[in-house]
């Protein structure tokens, strides 16, 4: 419940041992009390004890002092717990009865007789201070005190504010005396669920998932994520924004790996060749006749330029070369074909077209084949067409991408929604949020995936909107939402009029 009405009985005096009807008790009035607490009534009436009721065992005979007792039978102060917002007003009926029967359970005994009763109506604020009172009638006097306090985890003027300290994924806080949250060190936000990052952690380039942490976003590094990462492979350069490569003095090229003075520093060109500071490696060697190679380090073979065509093999001669032609070809470089379309030279279903009045030919290749005679198969996976780690597979005339889990599309370029896998059980509704799928559960279910069947407090799932107070009803699955001013609906989900600050989502 949200609070407890406590009644402390202190002393009861019935010196003559009389009942309310004027008869005397024999041998004395064995006295127990019935307490009925209900909503405020200007005139107290019979009817249910709407805020609760309790009975005591026999506490004494005729006149006696009631001692405080914290457990077992005859507990004092008496506890009347409630689980609603304390309204601040009440009616209390205290009846003293005589029983001839069982001391411990006098309620069950026949022949109980009323000694006296008192009725108190008024207002009472929640607080720790006891209100003391004494009531007299012609025969009896009762001294007592009472107060209303909030149960554990309930706070505020009407014990309506629930606050339970926690230190988990949903929040990191303790509760203030008024029920407001007090964040644990290192946490902030309305529900103390946002970590305070390492002091100085860059606001845009860094973030954290726990206090005093600084995780860098792509392109940034350093303890405070304030240092950019240069372009991958940047050798002699720096950056002012991520993936940049601004070259240091004397270096050039996309990766600042080309020494602009390479010729002077390294003298790479051999055999009397000329070096110039240019070209893809930062230098170029211009060779003297008879030499070749990147650094002019190779004596030139006459066959080095691959002069023989159509598969002819080259043989070095003293100052020249000679081509040995395969069957069907002739000429100094095997450039002439003796084959015609009549020899069916085109492979893999290629179409033969005659040229030069039938003395030569050309092959037109079908899809997936290339080469002068359509002898080479085209590999359609060489261009790496599959995104997001998809596997490329050649399938006849086409190719397909086999996607990793979570991706789809011809090229695996589309993300599959987390909700597409229907993760919510028991008819729960899935919402794709930034940190993954979240399920909204139907009544009677809870949990991340609506997998937990609720068999206890129907208010535990927090069904009420807009700060309404939830009360459980007569059966476990019933609840009632007590709406704040300006809201209606069985869950207080409808604002009557909308202020500009209302959270609109288009």
């Amino acid at each position: 419940g949200s609070g407890i009405f406590q009644l402390r009985l202190q002393e009861f005096v019935n010196q003559r041992g009389m009942l309310a009807n004027g008869q005397s008790c024999e041998p004395g009035c064995r006295t127990f009390f019935r307490i009925c607490l209900k909503h405020f009534q200007a005139t107290f009436s019979e009817g249910p004890c709407t805020f609760g009721n309790v009975s005591t065992p026999v506490l004494g005979t005729n006149s006696f002092v009631v001692r405080d007792k914290n457990s077992g039978s005859g507990r004092n102060p008496l506890q009347l717990p409630f689980n609603f917002t304390w309204p601040g007003t009440f009616s209390l009926n205290i009846q003293a009865w005589h029983t001839p029967g069982d001391d411990l359970r006098p309620e069950t005994s026949p022949g109980n007789s009323l000694i006296s009763q008192i009725i108190i109506q008024g207002s009472l604020a929640v607080g720790k201070i006891w209100r003391t009172d004494e009531q007299n009638d012609t025969l009896t006097r009762l001294s007592y005190s009472y107060r209303v306090i909030c149960s554990d985890n309930y706070y505020g003027e009407s014990c309506s504010r629930l606050c339970k300290k926690r230190d988990d994924h949903f929040g990191h806080y303790e509760c203030q005396p008024d029920g407001s949250l007090s964040c644990l060190p290192g946490w902030t936000g309305k529900y103390c669920d946002q970590p305070i990052c390492l002091s100085g952690c860059h606001e845009q380039n860094g973030y954290c998932s726990k206090p005093d942490e600084c995780i860098c976003r792509p392109g940034w590094q350093g303890r405070l994520c304030n240092e950019c990462i240069p372009h991958n492979g940047c050798r002699h350069g720096t950056c002012s924004i991520p993936w940049q490569c601004a070259c240091d003095e004397g270096w050039g090229g996309l990766f600042c790996d080309q020494d602009l003075n390479y010729c002077t520093h390294h003298s790479p060109c051999k055999n009397g060749s000329t070096c110039s500071n240019s070209g893809p490696k930062g230098y170029t060697c211009t060779c003297l006749p008879g030499y070749t190679g990147e650094h002019c380090e190779l004596g030139l073979s006459k066959c080095a330029s691959n002069p023989c065509r159509n598969g002819g093999s080259c043989k070095d001669q003293e100052n020249s070369y000679h081509c040995l032609c395969p069957p069907g070809y002739y000429g100094q470089h095997c450039e002439h074909s003796t084959l015609t379309c009549a020899d069916s030279p085109c492979f893999n279903g290629g179409s033969c077209r005659e040229r030069n009045q039938g003395s030569s030919y050309a092959c037109e290749c079908p899809p997936n084949f290339t080469g002068s005679n359509c002898e080479k198969k085209v590999d359609r996976c060489t261009s790496n067409p599959c995104a997001n780690g998809g596997q490329c597979q050649n399938r006849g005339p086409s190719r397909t991408c086999r996607c990793r889990p979570g991706f789809t599309g011809t090229h695996c370029e589309l993300h599959i929604s987390d909700c597409a896998r229907s993760p919510c059980a028991h008819g729960g509704t899935c919402h794709d949020l930034e940190n993954g799928p979240v399920c909204t559960c139907p009544a009677g279910f809870s949990g991340r995936r609506c997998e937990v069947r609720i068999t206890h407090d129907a208010c535990a799932s927090g069904p009420c909107f807009n700060g309404a107070t939830c009360y459980t009803g007569l059966s476990p699955n019933n609840f009632v939402c007590n709406c704040p001013y300006g809201f209606v609906g069985s869950r207080c989900e409808f604002p009557v009029g909308l202020p500009p600050s209302f959270p609109w989502v288009a």
Epitope: G427, V438, T440, F465, S490, R491, E493, F494
Partner: nanobody, 119 residues
Amino acid sequence: EVQLVESGGGLVQAGGSLRLSCAASGSTFSNYAMGWYRQAPGKQRELVVGISSDGSTHYADSAKGRFTISRDDAKNTVYLQMNSLKTEDTAVYYCYVPVKVAGLEYAYWGQGTQVTVSS
């Protein structure tokens, strides 16, 4: 992504009738409350009628006896039947779905449909 699309608005003479529809997509709405709000020029948005997830209805005083809300969960659609229309009913009418996700409250709104009642 939840989307609400209203239709059925238009120009009607005082005393006439209109039926507004709000089709919801991106979720199953049988477990949710749905409602109709309206906003006249220069005024705040106000509740016309809401239907809670348990089926109970909540009408503004100005709508009682003239307007009726109903829902078809199979079609994910909520309707507003408006009879005996008055000039003061002229406004943009918005569909509204309140949702609680992981303890946080979200309010989904449609783009609105204009209702004009002429004298």
